[in-house]
Interface confidence: medium
Protein backbone atom coordinates (compact mmCIF):
# COMPACT_ATOMS: atom_id res chain seq x y z
CA UNK A 1 0.00 0.00 0.00
CA UNK A 2 1.01 3.61 -0.34
CA UNK A 3 3.28 4.81 2.35
CA UNK A 4 4.50 1.40 3.35
CA UNK A 5 8.13 2.32 3.18
CA UNK A 6 9.70 -0.32 5.35
CA UNK A 7 9.35 -4.05 5.47
CA UNK A 8 8.27 -4.39 9.08
CA UNK A 9 9.01 -7.42 11.17
CA UNK A 10 6.56 -10.26 10.87
CA UNK A 11 6.44 -12.19 14.11
CA UNK A 12 4.20 -15.21 14.39
CA UNK A 13 4.30 -17.31 17.49
CA UNK A 14 4.84 -20.99 16.77
CA UNK A 15 3.34 -23.75 18.88
CA UNK A 16 5.25 -24.62 22.00
CA UNK A 17 6.81 -27.98 21.19
CA UNK A 18 8.46 -30.42 23.56
CA UNK A 19 11.89 -29.04 22.84
CA UNK A 20 10.84 -25.52 23.72
CA UNK A 21 9.12 -26.65 26.88
CA UNK A 22 12.11 -28.73 27.91
CA UNK A 23 14.18 -25.58 28.23
CA UNK A 24 11.83 -24.00 30.75
CA UNK A 25 12.90 -23.75 34.34
CA UNK A 26 10.56 -25.35 36.85
CA UNK A 27 7.64 -22.99 37.42
CA UNK A 28 7.22 -21.22 40.72
CA UNK A 29 5.05 -22.98 43.26
CA UNK A 30 2.60 -21.96 45.96
CA UNK A 31 2.43 -20.05 48.17
CA UNK A 32 4.47 -17.57 46.15
CA UNK A 33 2.43 -18.29 43.05
CA UNK A 34 -1.32 -18.81 43.12
CA UNK A 35 -1.81 -19.16 39.36
CA UNK A 36 0.49 -20.03 36.49
CA UNK A 37 0.18 -18.46 33.06
CA UNK A 38 2.22 -18.53 29.87
CA UNK A 39 4.96 -15.95 29.56
CA UNK A 40 4.19 -12.75 27.65
CA UNK A 41 4.53 -12.66 23.89
CA UNK A 42 5.64 -15.92 22.31
CA UNK A 43 7.02 -17.35 25.53
CA UNK A 44 6.32 -21.03 26.15
CA UNK A 45 7.27 -21.27 29.80
CA UNK A 46 5.00 -20.73 32.75
CA UNK A 47 5.29 -17.85 35.15
CA UNK A 48 3.17 -16.42 37.94
CA UNK A 49 0.05 -14.61 36.90
CA UNK A 50 -0.36 -11.08 38.12
CA UNK A 51 -3.00 -10.75 40.80
CA UNK A 52 -5.86 -8.32 41.14
CA UNK A 53 -4.47 -4.87 41.81
CA UNK A 54 -0.96 -5.70 40.58
CA UNK A 55 0.70 -3.24 38.24
CA UNK A 56 0.72 -4.38 34.62
CA UNK A 57 1.17 -3.19 31.07
CA UNK A 58 1.70 -4.19 27.49
CA UNK A 59 5.05 -5.73 28.22
CA UNK A 60 4.58 -7.26 31.65
CA UNK A 61 3.44 -10.67 32.77
CA UNK A 62 -0.19 -11.52 32.19
CA UNK A 63 -3.01 -10.89 34.62
CA UNK A 64 -4.67 -13.94 36.14
CA UNK A 65 -7.88 -15.60 35.05
CA UNK A 66 -10.81 -13.23 34.83
CA UNK A 67 -8.55 -10.20 35.12
CA UNK A 68 -7.51 -7.72 32.48
CA UNK A 69 -4.81 -5.09 32.47
CA UNK A 70 -6.51 -1.70 32.54
CA UNK A 71 -5.58 1.92 33.07
CA UNK A 72 -6.54 3.52 36.35
CA UNK A 73 -10.06 4.97 36.21
CA UNK A 74 -8.85 8.56 36.40
CA UNK A 75 -5.96 8.00 33.98
CA UNK A 76 -5.89 10.91 31.56
CA UNK A 77 -3.71 9.10 29.06
CA UNK A 78 -4.69 5.46 29.15
CA UNK A 79 -2.56 4.36 26.24
CA UNK A 80 0.51 5.88 27.72
CA UNK A 81 -0.23 4.21 31.00
CA UNK A 82 -0.45 0.72 29.57
CA UNK A 83 2.64 1.18 27.50
CA UNK A 84 4.50 2.21 30.59
CA UNK A 85 3.28 -0.58 32.83
CA UNK A 86 1.11 1.72 34.90
CA UNK A 87 -2.05 -0.27 34.45
CA UNK A 88 -3.49 -2.61 37.04
CA UNK A 89 -5.12 -6.00 36.94
CA UNK A 90 -8.84 -5.70 37.43
CA UNK A 91 -12.05 -7.47 36.50
CA UNK A 92 -12.02 -8.17 32.80
CA UNK A 93 -15.26 -6.36 32.04
CA UNK A 94 -13.90 -2.83 31.77
CA UNK A 95 -11.80 -1.46 28.91
CA UNK A 96 -8.87 0.91 29.21
CA UNK A 97 -7.05 3.57 27.29
CA UNK A 98 -3.87 4.15 25.37
CA UNK A 99 -1.64 6.29 27.51
CA UNK A 100 -0.29 3.23 29.13
CA UNK A 101 1.36 2.21 25.93
CA UNK A 102 3.55 5.22 25.38
CA UNK A 103 7.13 6.08 26.19
CA UNK A 104 7.59 6.74 29.82
CA UNK A 105 10.02 7.24 32.61
CA UNK A 106 10.78 4.21 34.73
CA UNK A 107 8.52 4.13 37.75
CA UNK A 108 10.12 3.99 41.18
CA UNK A 109 10.82 0.43 42.11
CA UNK A 110 10.93 -0.81 38.55
CA UNK A 111 13.83 -2.79 37.20
CA UNK A 112 16.46 -0.39 36.00
CA UNK A 113 17.99 -0.53 32.56
CA UNK A 114 21.28 -1.72 33.92
CA UNK A 115 19.60 -4.50 35.85
CA UNK A 116 17.61 -5.57 32.85
CA UNK A 117 20.64 -5.67 30.63
CA UNK A 118 22.57 -7.50 33.29
CA UNK A 119 19.86 -10.13 33.48
CA UNK A 120 19.39 -10.60 29.76
CA UNK A 121 21.94 -12.78 28.12
CA UNK A 122 20.30 -13.20 24.76
CA UNK A 123 20.82 -11.66 21.36
CA UNK A 124 18.27 -8.98 22.08
CA UNK A 125 20.39 -7.35 24.73
CA UNK A 126 23.52 -7.57 22.64
CA UNK A 127 22.29 -6.24 19.36
CA UNK A 128 19.49 -3.76 19.90
CA UNK A 129 21.13 -0.34 19.88
CA UNK A 130 20.42 2.18 22.57
CA UNK A 131 18.72 4.36 20.02
CA UNK A 132 15.75 2.02 20.06
CA UNK A 133 14.24 3.29 23.27
CA UNK A 134 10.88 4.66 24.20
CA UNK A 135 9.48 8.07 25.11
CA UNK A 136 6.93 9.83 27.28
CA UNK A 137 3.54 9.93 25.65
CA UNK A 138 0.03 8.70 25.97
CA UNK A 139 1.00 6.11 23.50
CA UNK A 140 4.41 5.74 24.85
CA UNK A 141 6.76 4.16 22.40
CA UNK A 142 7.24 0.60 23.40
CA UNK A 143 10.00 0.34 25.90
CA UNK A 144 13.07 -1.47 24.78
CA UNK A 145 13.95 -1.92 28.40
CA UNK A 146 11.47 -3.84 30.49
CA UNK A 147 11.24 -1.18 33.11
CA UNK A 148 7.59 -1.94 33.56
CA UNK A 149 8.25 -4.98 35.72
CA UNK A 150 8.25 -4.14 39.37
CA UNK A 151 11.10 -5.30 41.53
CA UNK A 152 8.73 -6.36 44.25
CA UNK A 153 6.74 -8.47 41.89
CA UNK A 154 9.86 -9.98 40.42
CA UNK A 155 10.38 -11.82 43.69
CA UNK A 156 7.06 -13.64 43.26
CA UNK A 157 7.13 -13.92 39.51
CA UNK A 158 10.52 -14.65 38.12
CA UNK A 159 10.93 -14.52 34.39
CA UNK A 160 12.58 -17.61 32.98
CA UNK A 161 14.63 -16.43 30.07
CA UNK A 162 15.47 -18.61 27.12
CA UNK A 163 18.27 -17.37 24.91
CA UNK A 164 17.86 -17.13 21.20
CA UNK A 165 19.37 -20.05 19.39
CA UNK A 166 22.68 -19.00 17.96
CA UNK A 167 22.56 -18.11 14.29
CA UNK A 168 25.21 -18.14 11.62
CA UNK A 169 25.24 -14.40 11.36
CA UNK A 170 27.60 -11.55 11.84
CA UNK A 171 25.03 -9.50 13.65
CA UNK A 172 26.92 -9.61 16.91
CA UNK A 173 30.15 -8.53 15.28
CA UNK A 174 29.15 -5.01 14.33
CA UNK A 175 31.67 -2.61 15.72
CA UNK A 176 30.69 -0.02 18.28
CA UNK A 177 31.53 2.50 15.59
CA UNK A 178 28.87 1.15 13.28
CA UNK A 179 26.37 1.15 16.11
CA UNK A 180 26.80 4.88 16.43
CA UNK A 181 26.09 5.48 12.81
CA UNK A 182 22.61 6.47 11.77
CA UNK A 183 23.00 4.65 8.46
CA UNK A 184 22.35 0.94 8.36
CA UNK A 185 21.81 -1.56 5.61
CA UNK A 186 18.25 -2.83 5.17
CA UNK A 187 18.96 -6.19 6.78
CA UNK A 188 20.42 -4.56 9.85
CA UNK A 189 17.38 -2.31 10.12
CA UNK A 190 14.97 -5.21 9.82
CA UNK A 191 16.89 -7.16 12.41
CA UNK A 192 16.88 -4.23 14.82
CA UNK A 193 13.22 -3.55 14.29
CA UNK A 194 12.37 -7.18 14.88
CA UNK A 195 14.48 -7.49 18.00
CA UNK A 196 13.28 -4.11 19.18
CA UNK A 197 9.64 -5.08 19.02
CA UNK A 198 10.34 -8.49 20.49
CA UNK A 199 12.00 -6.81 23.40
CA UNK A 200 9.02 -4.52 23.80
CA UNK A 201 6.82 -7.56 23.97
CA UNK A 202 9.06 -9.25 26.52
CA UNK A 203 9.39 -12.10 24.08
CA UNK A 204 12.31 -13.94 25.51
CA UNK A 205 11.89 -17.16 23.57
CA UNK A 206 10.89 -16.04 20.07
CA UNK A 207 10.72 -19.38 18.32
CA UNK A 208 9.49 -19.14 14.78
CA UNK A 209 10.65 -15.56 14.44
CA UNK A 210 12.79 -14.91 11.41
CA UNK A 211 15.71 -12.74 12.41
CA UNK A 212 17.48 -11.99 9.16
CA UNK A 213 21.00 -13.08 8.37
CA UNK A 214 23.01 -9.91 7.78
CA UNK A 215 26.52 -9.21 6.61
CA UNK A 216 28.80 -6.77 8.38
CA UNK A 217 27.56 -3.86 6.32
CA UNK A 218 23.99 -4.50 7.32
CA UNK A 219 22.87 -5.99 4.01
CA UNK A 220 21.28 -9.38 3.56
CA UNK A 221 23.48 -12.41 3.21
CA UNK A 222 22.76 -14.53 0.15
CA UNK A 223 21.26 -17.34 2.15
CA UNK A 224 18.40 -16.82 4.57
CA UNK A 225 17.00 -19.60 6.72
CA UNK A 226 14.09 -20.06 9.07
CA UNK A 227 15.09 -21.23 12.55
CA UNK A 228 15.38 -24.95 13.08
CA UNK A 229 12.73 -26.72 15.09
CA UNK A 230 14.27 -29.54 17.03
CA UNK A 231 15.88 -31.92 14.53
CA UNK A 232 13.95 -30.38 11.66
CA UNK A 233 16.08 -27.85 9.84
CA UNK A 234 14.42 -24.63 8.86
CA UNK A 235 14.12 -24.18 5.12
CA UNK A 236 16.41 -21.72 3.36
CA UNK A 237 16.09 -19.42 0.40
CA UNK A 238 18.29 -17.05 -1.58
CA UNK A 239 18.00 -13.29 -1.65
CA UNK A 240 19.77 -10.32 -3.11
CA UNK A 241 21.55 -7.80 -0.88
CA UNK A 242 18.26 -5.97 -0.29
CA UNK A 243 16.46 -9.07 0.93
CA UNK A 244 14.39 -9.69 -2.18
CA UNK A 245 13.91 -13.42 -2.81
CA UNK A 246 15.55 -14.67 -5.98
CA UNK A 247 13.45 -16.86 -8.28
CA UNK A 248 14.49 -20.44 -8.78
CA UNK A 249 16.20 -20.79 -5.40
CA UNK A 250 13.24 -21.44 -3.12
CA UNK A 251 13.51 -24.97 -1.79
CA UNK A 252 10.16 -24.88 0.01
CA UNK A 253 11.96 -26.76 2.74
CA UNK A 254 12.63 -29.88 0.64
CA UNK A 255 16.36 -29.69 0.14
CA UNK A 256 19.26 -27.57 1.16
CA UNK A 257 19.78 -24.58 -1.07
CA UNK A 258 23.01 -23.26 -2.52
CA UNK A 259 23.13 -19.58 -3.38
CA UNK A 260 26.48 -19.68 -5.11
CA UNK A 261 25.72 -17.62 -8.17
CA UNK A 262 23.67 -15.01 -6.40
CA UNK A 263 25.15 -11.52 -6.25
CA UNK A 264 24.14 -10.34 -2.84
CA UNK A 265 27.25 -9.32 -1.00
Amino acid sequence: GAGAVGAGPVVRCEPCDARALSQCAPPPTAPACTELVREPGCGCCLTCALREGDACGVYTERCGTGLRCQPRPAEQYPLRALLNGRGFCANASAAGSLSTYLPSQPAPGNISESEEEHNAGSVESQVVPSTHRVTDSKFHPLHAKMDVIKKGHARDSQRYKVDYESQSTDTQNFSSESKRETEYGPCRREMEDTLNHLKFLNVLSPRGVHIPNCDKKGFYKKKQCRPSKGRKRGFCWCVDKYGQPLPGYDTKGKDDVHCLSVQSQ
Partner: antibody
Framework: QVQLQQSGAEVKKPGSSVKVSCKAS????????TSWVRQAPGQGLEWMGG????????EYAQKLEGRVTITVDESTNTAYMELSSLRFEDTAVYYC???????????WGQGTLVTVSS | EIVLTQSPLSLPVTPGEPASISCRSS???????????LNWYLQKPGQSPQLLIY???RRASGVPDRFSGSGSGTDFTLKISRVEAEDVGVYYC?????????FGQGTKVETK
Protein backbone atom coordinates in the same frame (compact mmCIF):
# COMPACT_ATOMS: atom_id res chain seq x y z
CA GLN B 1 5.12 -6.96 4.25
CA VAL B 2 2.59 -5.26 6.50
CA GLN B 3 -0.47 -3.95 4.71
CA LEU B 4 -3.39 -1.91 5.98
CA GLN B 5 -6.46 -2.14 3.75
CA GLN B 6 -9.24 0.36 4.37
CA SER B 7 -12.91 0.32 3.40
CA GLY B 8 -14.28 2.38 0.54
CA ALA B 9 -15.41 5.99 0.25
CA GLU B 10 -18.55 7.12 2.04
CA VAL B 11 -21.03 9.96 1.53
CA LYS B 12 -22.96 10.86 4.68
CA LYS B 13 -25.51 13.42 5.80
CA PRO B 14 -24.85 15.86 8.64
CA GLY B 15 -25.79 14.37 12.00
CA SER B 16 -25.31 10.79 10.87
CA SER B 17 -22.45 8.41 11.66
CA VAL B 18 -19.77 6.71 9.59
CA LYS B 19 -17.74 3.60 10.37
CA VAL B 20 -14.47 3.00 8.52
CA SER B 21 -12.56 -0.28 8.70
CA CYS B 22 -8.85 -1.05 8.48
CA LYS B 23 -7.71 -4.64 8.01
CA ALA B 24 -4.11 -5.44 8.87
CA SER B 25 -2.16 -8.29 7.31
CA UNK B 26 1.42 -9.48 7.40
CA UNK B 27 2.56 -8.52 10.86
CA UNK B 28 1.89 -8.20 14.55
CA UNK B 29 -1.42 -6.52 15.26
CA UNK B 30 -2.41 -6.80 18.88
CA UNK B 31 0.49 -5.02 20.54
CA UNK B 32 0.87 -2.09 18.17
CA UNK B 33 -1.10 1.11 18.40
CA THR B 34 -3.51 1.32 15.50
CA SER B 35 -4.21 5.01 15.07
CA TRP B 36 -6.56 7.03 12.93
CA VAL B 37 -5.35 10.21 11.30
CA ARG B 38 -7.52 12.46 9.16
CA GLN B 39 -6.80 15.08 6.56
CA ALA B 40 -9.38 17.64 5.46
CA PRO B 41 -9.15 18.78 1.83
CA GLY B 42 -6.02 20.88 1.35
CA GLN B 43 -5.21 20.67 5.06
CA GLY B 44 -2.66 18.96 7.26
CA LEU B 45 -2.70 15.73 9.27
CA GLU B 46 -4.65 15.39 12.51
CA TRP B 47 -4.32 12.47 14.92
CA MET B 48 -7.78 11.34 16.02
CA GLY B 49 -6.93 8.57 18.45
CA GLY B 50 -5.69 5.04 18.69
CA UNK B 51 -6.17 1.63 20.20
CA UNK B 52 -3.98 -1.17 21.51
CA UNK B 53 -5.95 -4.27 20.60
CA UNK B 54 -4.34 -6.53 23.19
CA UNK B 55 -5.86 -4.44 25.96
CA UNK B 56 -8.76 -2.88 24.13
CA UNK B 57 -7.23 0.35 25.34
CA UNK B 58 -8.16 3.50 23.50
CA GLU B 59 -7.24 7.14 23.56
CA TYR B 60 -8.80 9.98 21.64
CA ALA B 61 -7.90 13.51 20.69
CA GLN B 62 -9.68 15.85 23.07
CA LYS B 63 -11.53 17.77 20.36
CA LEU B 64 -13.15 14.56 19.13
CA GLU B 65 -13.82 12.94 22.50
CA GLY B 66 -17.40 11.75 22.67
CA ARG B 67 -17.84 11.63 18.90
CA VAL B 68 -15.19 9.13 17.88
CA THR B 69 -15.02 5.46 18.85
CA ILE B 70 -12.17 3.15 17.86
CA THR B 71 -12.68 -0.58 18.17
CA VAL B 72 -10.97 -3.76 16.98
CA ASP B 73 -11.88 -7.26 16.00
CA GLU B 74 -8.78 -9.24 16.86
CA SER B 75 -10.09 -12.36 15.16
CA THR B 76 -9.84 -10.59 11.80
CA ASN B 77 -7.05 -8.12 12.66
CA THR B 78 -9.41 -5.30 11.78
CA ALA B 79 -9.67 -1.88 13.41
CA TYR B 80 -12.71 0.36 13.10
CA MET B 81 -13.22 4.06 13.51
CA GLU B 82 -16.73 5.36 14.01
CA LEU B 83 -17.42 9.08 13.95
CA SER B 84 -20.87 10.24 14.99
CA SER B 85 -22.84 13.48 14.76
CA LEU B 86 -21.08 14.24 11.50
CA ARG B 87 -20.50 17.85 10.49
CA PHE B 88 -19.54 19.37 7.17
CA GLU B 89 -16.06 19.98 8.52
CA ASP B 90 -15.61 16.23 9.07
CA THR B 91 -15.24 15.85 5.31
CA ALA B 92 -11.74 14.40 5.02
CA VAL B 93 -9.60 11.47 4.05
CA TYR B 94 -9.33 9.15 7.03
CA TYR B 95 -6.16 7.06 7.36
CA CYS B 96 -5.37 4.19 9.66
CA UNK B 97 -1.72 3.89 10.61
CA UNK B 98 0.35 1.54 12.73
CA UNK B 99 2.72 2.80 15.38
CA UNK B 100 5.25 0.58 17.09
CA UNK B 101 7.57 1.05 19.98
CA UNK B 102 9.30 4.11 18.67
CA UNK B 103 6.12 6.14 18.26
CA UNK B 104 6.24 6.53 14.53
CA UNK B 105 3.73 5.44 11.92
CA UNK B 106 5.60 2.94 9.82
CA UNK B 107 2.61 1.73 7.84
CA TRP B 108 -0.45 3.59 6.56
CA GLY B 109 -3.68 2.53 4.96
CA GLN B 110 -4.59 3.91 1.55
CA GLY B 111 -7.11 6.34 3.03
CA THR B 112 -10.89 6.51 3.00
CA LEU B 113 -12.65 9.64 1.76
CA VAL B 114 -15.67 10.54 3.87
CA THR B 115 -17.82 13.31 2.43
CA VAL B 116 -20.42 14.98 4.62
CA SER B 117 -23.01 16.59 2.40
CA SER B 118 -26.68 17.42 2.64
CA GLU C 1 -0.56 19.38 23.73
CA ILE C 2 2.75 19.79 21.98
CA VAL C 3 2.66 22.24 19.08
CA LEU C 4 4.99 21.78 16.13
CA THR C 5 5.78 24.73 13.86
CA GLN C 6 7.32 24.12 10.45
CA SER C 7 9.11 26.59 8.24
CA PRO C 8 8.97 27.44 5.49
CA LEU C 9 5.41 26.47 4.61
CA SER C 10 6.29 26.53 0.93
CA LEU C 11 9.63 25.64 -0.56
CA PRO C 12 10.36 26.01 -4.28
CA VAL C 13 13.31 23.81 -5.17
CA THR C 14 15.59 23.20 -8.11
CA PRO C 15 16.40 19.56 -8.89
CA GLY C 16 19.96 18.78 -7.94
CA GLU C 17 20.07 21.52 -5.32
CA PRO C 18 19.86 21.00 -1.55
CA ALA C 19 16.75 21.78 0.50
CA SER C 20 16.10 22.17 4.20
CA ILE C 21 12.95 22.22 6.33
CA SER C 22 12.78 23.28 9.97
CA CYS C 23 10.47 21.98 12.70
CA ARG C 24 10.25 23.64 16.08
CA SER C 25 8.48 22.10 19.06
CA SER C 26 6.73 23.94 21.87
CA UNK C 27 8.50 21.65 24.34
CA UNK C 28 11.49 19.39 24.32
CA UNK C 29 11.09 16.07 22.54
CA UNK C 30 14.20 14.65 24.17
CA UNK C 31 13.33 11.69 26.36
CA UNK C 32 15.42 10.72 29.35
CA UNK C 33 16.52 7.66 27.38
CA UNK C 34 18.39 9.95 24.98
CA UNK C 35 15.97 9.66 22.08
CA UNK C 36 14.29 12.58 20.39
CA UNK C 37 10.79 11.49 19.40
CA LEU C 38 10.51 13.51 16.22
CA ASN C 39 9.52 11.92 12.92
CA TRP C 40 9.36 13.18 9.35
CA TYR C 41 6.85 12.08 6.73
CA LEU C 42 6.43 12.82 3.05
CA GLN C 43 3.03 12.87 1.45
CA LYS C 44 3.27 12.74 -2.30
CA PRO C 45 0.32 14.03 -4.32
CA GLY C 46 -2.60 11.60 -4.13
CA GLN C 47 -0.82 9.20 -1.77
CA SER C 48 -0.77 8.28 1.89
CA PRO C 49 2.01 9.76 3.99
CA GLN C 50 5.21 7.71 4.18
CA LEU C 51 7.78 7.60 6.93
CA LEU C 52 11.14 9.16 6.10
CA ILE C 53 12.90 9.73 9.41
CA TYR C 54 12.19 8.61 12.97
CA UNK C 55 13.90 9.35 16.26
CA UNK C 56 15.07 12.63 14.73
CA UNK C 57 17.80 11.10 12.58
CA ARG C 58 17.10 7.44 11.79
CA ARG C 59 16.24 6.87 8.16
CA ALA C 60 13.34 4.51 7.60
CA SER C 61 13.91 1.41 5.53
CA GLY C 62 14.02 2.12 1.82
CA VAL C 63 14.47 5.86 2.18
CA PRO C 64 17.25 7.25 -0.05
CA ASP C 65 20.34 8.52 1.73
CA ARG C 66 19.85 11.99 0.31
CA PHE C 67 17.35 12.48 3.14
CA SER C 68 18.79 13.20 6.57
CA GLY C 69 17.36 14.39 9.86
CA SER C 70 19.05 16.22 12.69
CA GLY C 71 18.30 18.19 15.81
CA SER C 72 17.54 17.68 19.47
CA GLY C 73 15.24 19.10 22.08
CA THR C 74 13.01 21.62 20.35
CA ASP C 75 14.73 22.33 17.04
CA PHE C 76 14.86 19.82 14.20
CA THR C 77 15.83 19.89 10.54
CA LEU C 78 15.14 17.69 7.55
CA LYS C 79 17.67 18.03 4.75
CA ILE C 80 17.62 16.78 1.20
CA SER C 81 21.15 16.85 -0.14
CA ARG C 82 20.13 16.87 -3.81
CA VAL C 83 16.46 17.26 -4.58
CA GLU C 84 15.01 14.96 -7.21
CA ALA C 85 11.77 15.42 -9.10
CA GLU C 86 10.13 12.59 -7.16
CA ASP C 87 10.71 14.41 -3.86
CA VAL C 88 7.90 16.88 -4.43
CA GLY C 89 5.02 16.75 -1.98
CA VAL C 90 4.17 17.91 1.51
CA TYR C 91 6.61 17.17 4.33
CA TYR C 92 5.29 16.84 7.88
CA CYS C 93 7.09 16.59 11.17
CA UNK C 94 5.35 14.68 13.97
CA UNK C 95 6.12 14.26 17.64
CA UNK C 96 5.75 10.86 19.29
CA UNK C 97 6.75 11.85 22.78
CA UNK C 98 3.27 12.43 24.14
CA UNK C 99 -0.26 11.79 23.10
CA UNK C 100 -2.04 13.44 21.51
CA UNK C 101 0.50 12.84 18.80
CA UNK C 102 0.73 16.03 16.81
CA PHE C 103 1.93 17.08 13.38
CA GLY C 104 3.43 20.25 11.99
CA GLN C 105 1.38 22.24 9.47
CA GLY C 106 3.35 20.79 6.59
CA THR C 107 5.86 22.19 4.12
CA LYS C 108 4.95 22.02 0.45
CA VAL C 109 7.98 21.29 -1.67
CA GLU C 110 7.58 21.93 -5.39
CA THR C 111 9.99 22.35 -8.23
CA LYS C 112 10.64 25.84 -9.57
Amino acid sequence: QVQLQQSGAEVKKPGSSVKVSCKASGGIFSTYVTSWVRQAPGQGLEWMGGIIPMFDTTEYAQKLEGRVTITVDESTNTAYMELSSLRFEDTAVYYCARAGGLSHFDYWGQGTLVTVSS
Amino acid sequence: EIVLTQSPLSLPVTPGEPASISCRSSQSLLHSNGNNYLNWYLQKPGQSPQLLIYLSSRRASGVPDRFSGSGSGTDFTLKISRVEAEDVGVYYCMQGLQTPWTFGQGTKVETK
